[in-house]
């Protein structure tokens, strides 16, 4: 019996087609992805093949103005239109709190939403009961397939799930649910979830009875053969893990941003064992037309976005200096504003010993693309912020050793004075440079805001200590020459859309007046 | 024809009786003021004398939890109960914006509310039309008396009147209104207003046709004879000004906080000339009983206040270190929080050349009386803040020379190490002390945040420049040994209630996490 698994993950609000790098579509003839194009491909496969499941491994939420404005209603609407068969909860599904998951998505989705390792307690338990499930048994043709969900255990540090959801260890939580499915005579089981490729592989290895793992969170691109675009495969598709009980378990993920549709064909024997598996992600490029009716619906929904982007988010009473002349040479107040917003967006007071899990921000000055003039009645709009941060990036959470951070700050000024983008703007960091010293030895003071303290204050950076830092995904991926970050990072979790982070902060603050306050000094 | 003028000014939300220093009443047998006691005295005088006017010269708004909770409704209600005959608008009447004046007070007051030098424009002009007046002619016995109002021209810098009210020069605006009254055959004219004693005297001198000036704003205490409490008279009551056209014009003011009832008897001839004037403020001490019916009404209104003071205003995720061990010795995050709130409360971006009219805050560490523990679910209540700031003070605006500020910072550490209260917490200031140097010469660096700039940044203090600073009224009055501030200040405007400033900021911010960030350093 043959099953076709179509899968997406980490779509992050890319409802419209995008450029090849998943930023805003500029030249339509070269654009990719988007729900209208995905619909075309999914329907094509459904018409051609008998047993098809369309699955999403989480993080539909967060990533473009679509999420900012529609807050998840757009996810439910278009996933319903695509007739997804199941979805796993990702960490970003909690970005607007549990209410922001329940109302727009859980209550509106016509497909099951899954996570076996999230347990509700207190008053939430009854409120959320039945709105998400640990597993779901789906009829496919004449057979049944069990789908069991999982979500990153780190979600409380990455999003806003509140205090009434407990995130358990994935493997510990999955095993009893899979066992239950077995007792229900379900012999074909897919683990669908959002904990990253390493955990996906562990699940394949450790959870008895899981036949296939469909993952997300780490934006992993797998491919067999010559890859069709710029993504470099982390392994073959599917990635085969030998389980502890000797089975060959295919593990898949489909990069991110709706650029690819994962396509996996599995052959099962009559006892539900996987006999063979093959496939590849399908690049959703312009050779696949966008379905015009879905496109028309997208265009209807777009209207509200265009209105939103010119509305006032808040006011500034100071010039927000995002000029290259400032931000690539010295502390600039636009950099301070953005870093302050990045920290504010990552407040997770989950432990009495730590006032917060993260206190530091770094931001390449070259990533700040425009100032904002306060003389337009102080008004700041989404449109203004999109000029400052035009690349559609995210502000991510990484873990780095102090020594890596020191290297990063040396890199920040290794060729100072040439208006290059690597000069770092900061938050929760006080740095002093001595430019008379040779490159690689110019950082003479580097103090960082403590986290394991009840009153935040600045202490000297310790080389061997592991620190959490918020930074643009561009830097996490080694951009602007920050190879040491990419090479040495100990953990990397994708965060919220850059503009959304700053816009939320400005809306919250109502009136802003960031200063140049001595975070960066030259001795 | 004899007229009795009863007058109050700068009552600042003291609806209940207070201690002698106008803070919260502790020992009722020694308490003073409050509307129930005022009612008793006013009614007594009304019964005894034929021609009585009860006037208020502005700043009923702002000062205690009464205003925080009731937002002006309490002012209208109890002033109506006292049957005030007229009120002038003070700067604080605009603290909640024009809407916060119109709805609770202007629309509800049963007495005229006056200001001749405030002109509405744009959409507000029709909305506010008739709700306040430049003048009002009041019948008193068989005569008529004209009352013409005025308000500090500085209100846009002191409060939140918005962009659709123009504050004109008082004298320029008053003269045509007085002339108009004269053409209406009104020959007894009182100028009732809120611009401070210096302006009151100027009005008496310059505005032809004004017979009496009843003022406010500067909390001026005038008295003839031996003063009955702690206030030291600034002059005799009434203070007589000789006008440019040779008339003797009595000028009065009645301190503040409802502690006194101004009592002025004027004798007019048949042409409306002042023949004589005499009187004194009446100390509303416990020898005057509180009216039991008004008291009962006060107690009914109180219930909501008690509920409010235990409700969550916002959250802290850090320990708010308001301990003496910290705030009297070094930068403390409670000091930073309070100073940040003080600046935030004084944002008035009225000029393109200045991002704000004020950027600096100083706060005596000894005025911070308690920490707030974050381990109570982070909750911050009014009750918590009242423990931090228990003295019922205000955060005022002063103008000082740089040299005065330098002296203040030297005083801050002149006897460092003895846990004395004069150690300054700051905002918009970076100070470096060298304690190895002799007292009076310990400030080695004093940088202040520019105001006449579009991007706020720190520049060295200039000795001869005039700076605006926000500070506690306690310091403006020379408390904690800051005699240099009291002696050398160039201007002093009373501000908002201390707790209200901090509570508003916390409510706005929702979650706070002030750090110790290097505002105060020791070299």
């Amino acid at each position: 019996w043959e099953l076709t698994i179509l899968h997406t993950n980490d779509v992050h609000s890319r409802l419209e087609q995008t450029s090849e790098d998943s930023s805003k579509c500029v030249n339509a003839s070269r654009c990719m992805g988007g729900v209208a194009r995905l619909f075309t491909k999914v329907q094509q496969i459904r018409r051609a093949e008998p047993n098809v499941l369309l699955l999403d491994a989480g993080d539909q939420y967060q990533g473009t103005i679509w999420f900012t404005v529609y807050k998840g209603a757009e996810v439910a609407h278009f996933m319903n239109a695509l007739r997804y068969d199941a979805m796993a909860l990702g960490n970003h599904e909690f970005d607007n709190g549990v209410e922001g998951l329940i109302e727009p998505l859980l209550k509106e989705a016509k497909f099951p939403i899954l996570s076996a390792n999230i347990k509700a307690k207190g008053p939430l338990a009854s409120q959320i009961s039945g709105l998400y499930l640990p597993y779901k048994v789906l009829p496919v043709g004449d057979e049944v397939v069990g789908i069991v969900g999982y979500t990153s255990k780190e979600t409380p540090f990455l999003s806003n799930p509140g205090t009434n959801l407990v995130f358990e260890d994935e493997i510990t939580a999955l095993q009893p649910e899979v066992d239950k499915l077995k007792t229900l005579n379900v012999n074909k089981i897919i683990a669908l979830g959002h904990s990253g490729f390493e955990m996906d592989k562990l699940i394949a290895q450790k959870v008895r009875g899981v036949d296939v793992v469909v993952g997300g969170h780490s934006n992993t691109f797998l491919y067999t053969g010559n890859p069709p675009s710029k993504e470099v495969p982390a392994g073959k598709y599917p990635f085969i893990v030998t389980s502890d009980d000797g089975r060959k378990v295919p593990v898949v993920q489909a990069y991110a941003f709706g650029k690819y549709l994962g396509y996996l064909k599995i052959e099962f024997d009559e006892r539900g064992n996987v006999i063979s598996s093959h496939g590849n992600p399908i690049l959703l490029n312009s050779s696949i037309p966008e379905d015009p009716s879905i496109k028309a619906d997208i265009n209807k929904w777009r209207i509200k976005l265009d209105n939103y982007s010119t509305q006032e988010l808040g006011k500034t009473i100071v010039y927000l200096d995002g000029s290259s002349q400032s931000c690539r040479f010295r502390e600039c107040n636009m950099g301070n504003l953005i870093c302050d917003a990045m920290i504010n967006n990552n407040l997770r007071h989950t432990d009495e010993m730590f006032w917060n899990h993260v206190s530091m921000c770094i931001l390449n000055g070259g990533g700040i693309r425009s100032p904002i003039d306060e003389r337009n009645n102080g008004t700041i709009t989404w449109e203004n912020l999109a000029a400052v941060l035009p690349f559609g990036g995210t502000f991510d959470l990484v873990q780095l050793k102090g020594s890596t951070l020191k290297k990063a700050f040396e890199h920040s000024v290794h060729r100072y004075g040439q208006s290059t983008g690597e000069f770092l703007q900061v938050g929760g960091i006080h740095v002093v440079y001595d430019l008379s010293r040779k490159p690689g030895d110019r950082v003479v003071k580097l103090d960082v805001l403590c986290t394991k303290c009840r009153v935040p204050s600045y202490d000297p950076l310790k080389m061997d200590e592991v620190y959490k830092v918020i930074l643009p995904n561009f830097l996490a991926n080694g951009g602007d020459g920050f190879q040491m970050i990419k090479d040495e990072l100990l953990r990397h979790d994708s965060g919220d859309q850059d503009i959304n982070v700053v816009s939320t902060y400005i809306s919250k603050m109502k009136v802003i007046y960031p200063a140049v306050e001595g975070r960066i000094k030259f001795s | 024809w004899e007229l009795t003028i009863l007058h109050t000014n700068d009552v600042h939300s003291r609806l209940e009786q207070t201690s002698e220093d106008s803070s919260k009443c502790v020992n009722a047998s020694r308490c003073m003021g409050g509307v129930a006691r005022l009612f008793t005295k006013v009614q007594q005088i009304r019964r005894a004398e034929p021609n009585v006017l009860l006037l208020d010269a502005g700043d009923q708004y702002q000062g205690t939890i009464w205003f925080t909770v009731y937002k002006g409704a309490e002012v209208a209600h109890f002033m109506n109960a006292l049957r005030y005959d007229a009120m002038a608008l003070g700067n604080h009447e605009f603290d909640n914006g024009v809407e916060g004046l119109i709805e609770p007070l202007l629309k509800e007051a049963k007495f005229p509310i006056l200001s001749a030098n405030i002109k509405a424009k744009g959409p507000l002009a029709s909305q506010i039309s008739g709700l306040y007046l430049p003048y009002k002619v009041l019948p008193v016995g068989d005569e008529v008396v004209g009352i013409v109002g005025y308000t500090s021209k500085e209100t846009p810098f002191l409060s939140n009147p918005g962009t659709n009210l123009v504050f004109e020069d008082e004298i320029t605006a008053l003269q045509p209104e007085v002339d108009k009254l004269k053409t209406l055959n009104v020959n007894k004219i009182i100028a009732l207003g809120h611009s401070g004693f210096e302006m009151d005297k100027l009005i008496a001198q310059k505005v032809r046709g004004v017979d009496v000036v009843v003022g406010g704003h500067s909390n001026t205490f005038l008295y003839t004879g031996n003063p009955p409490s702690k206030e030291v008279p600034a002059g005799k009551y009434p203070f007589i000004v000789t006008s440019d056209d040779g008339r003797k014009v009595p000028v009065v003011q009645a301190y503040a906080f409802g502690k006194y009832l101004g009592y002025l008897k004027i004798e007019f001839d048949e042409r409306g000339n002042v023949i004589s004037s005499h009187g004194n403020p009446i100390l509303l001490n416990s020898s005057i009983p509180e009216d039991p019916s008004i008291k009962a009404d006060i107690n009914k209104w109180r219930i909501k206040l008690d509920n409010y003071s235990t409700q969550e205003l916002g959250k802290t995720i850090v320990y708010l270190d308001g301990s003496s061990q910290s705030c009297r010795f070094r930068e403390c995050n409670m000091g930073n929080l309070i100073c940040d709130a003080m600046i935030n409360n004084n944002l008035r971006h009225t000029d393109e050349m200045f991002w704000n009219h004020v950027s600096m805050c100083i706060l005596n560490g000894g005025g911070i009386r308690s920490p707030i523990d974050e381990r109570n679910n982070g909750t911050i209540t009014w009750e918590n803040l009242a423990a931090v700031l228990p003295f019922g003070g205000t955060f005022d605006l002063v103008q000082l020379k740089g040299s005065t500020l330098k002296k203040a910072f030297e005083h801050s550490v002149h006897r460092y190490g003895q846990s004395t209260g004069e150690f300054l917490q700051v905002g918009g200031i970076h100070v470096v002390y060298d304690l190895s140097r002799k007292p009076g010469d310990r400030v080695v660096k004093l940088d202040v945040l520019c105001t006449k700039c579009r991007v706020p940044s720190y520049d060295p203090l200039k000795m001869d420049e005039v700076y605006k600073v926000i500070l506690p009224n306690f310091l403006a009055n020379g408390g904690d040994g800051f005699q240099m501030i009291k002696d050398e200040l160039l201007r002093h405007d009373s501000g908002d209630q201390d707790i209200n400033v901090v509570s508003t900021y916390i409510s706005k911010m929702k979650v706070i996490y002030p750090a110790v960030e290097g505002r105060i350093k020791f070299s």
Epitope: Q43, Q44, N80, I288, P289, P292, S293, I294, K295, A296 | -
Partner: antibody, heavy 121, light 111 residues
Framework: EVQLKESGAELVKPGASVKISCKAT????????IEWVKQRPGRGLEWIGE????????NYNEKFKGKATITADTSSNTAYMQLSSLTTEDSAIYYC??????????????WGQGTSVTVSS | DIVMTQSPASLAVSLGQRATISCKAS??????????MNWYQQKPGQPPKLLIH???NLESGIPARFSGSGSGTDFTLNIHPVEEEDAAVYFC?????????FGEGTKLEIK
């Protein structure tokens, strides 16, 4: 065999509403869009709107917004179109059609027999 | 909206001859090498019937005497040789974008 069977002719009074149906057989109902088209006697074809059964997605010709409401019931594989506030201008034959995909150029490959609606007092 | 202009409004063609109907779109209906133009035939008392999709692709069961051509904005339906049963009204329709729009129709009579 793909078939679309529409409900019978309707004679209705001005100001009233009418709801016509279109039952689909021979294919997966939720897999294809259902289109509605108006044809007045001796006139051309006017597209009214469409629905993707099983979803909330409908698209309408601006001209028919407020006039037509398209719904679908996946349990009975039936699409519906309600026409409200009828006038004589609404007298026409109304067709439902199945819309194909990119491989058939998004053309309307199967049509119902049409429902005649006559508005007359 | 894309406006479809069909010509002629009617034409009479002798049996065995060629009938040519034109359709012009107000903007291109091409996408990635495909033209989203369809042709329908409608006989009296019957619903329209799809003849050609994507400008030139004949529906199964439709005789080969029907052919379509064109790209961009200009399209043609050819019938050759015309037979008696081809008397009908022919409509073009663009399916590039919603709202779908039809031509006004061309009435073909057989002489």
């Amino acid at each position: 065999e793909v078939q679309l069977k529409e409900s019978g002719a309707e004679l209705v009074k001005p100001g009233a509403s009418v709801k016509i149906s279109c039952k689909a057989t021979g294919y997966t109902f939720t897999g294809y869009w259902i289109e509605w088209v108006k044809q007045r006697p001796g006139r051309g074809l006017e597209w009214i709107g469409e629905i993707l059964p099983g979803s909330d997605i409908t698209n309408y010709n601006e001209k028919f917004k407020g006039k037509a409401t398209i719904t679908a019931d996946t349990s009975s594989n039936t699409a519906y179109m309600q026409l409200s506030s009828l006038t004589t201008e609404d007298s026409a034959i109304y067709y439902c059609a199945r819309r194909g995909y990119d491989e058939t150029g998004y053309a309307m490959d199967y049509w119902g027999q049409g429902t005649s609606v006559t508005v007359s007092s | 909206d894309i406006v479809m202009t069909q010509s002629p409004a009617s034409l009479a063609v002798s049996l065995g001859q060629r009938a040519t109907i034109s359709c012009k779109a107000s903007q291109s209906v091409d996408y990635d090498g495909d033209s989203y133009m369809n042709w329908y035939q409608q006989k009296p008392g019957q619903p329209p019937k799809l003849l050609i999709h994507a400008a030139s692709n004949l529906e199964s069961g439709i005789p080969a005497r029907f052919s379509g051509s064109g790209s961009g904005t200009d399209f043609t339906l050819n019938i050759h040789p015309v037979e008696e049963e081809d008397a009908a009204v022919y409509f073009c329709q663009q399916s590039k974008e919603v709202p779908w729009t039809f031509g006004e129709g061309t009435k073909l009579e057989i002489k």
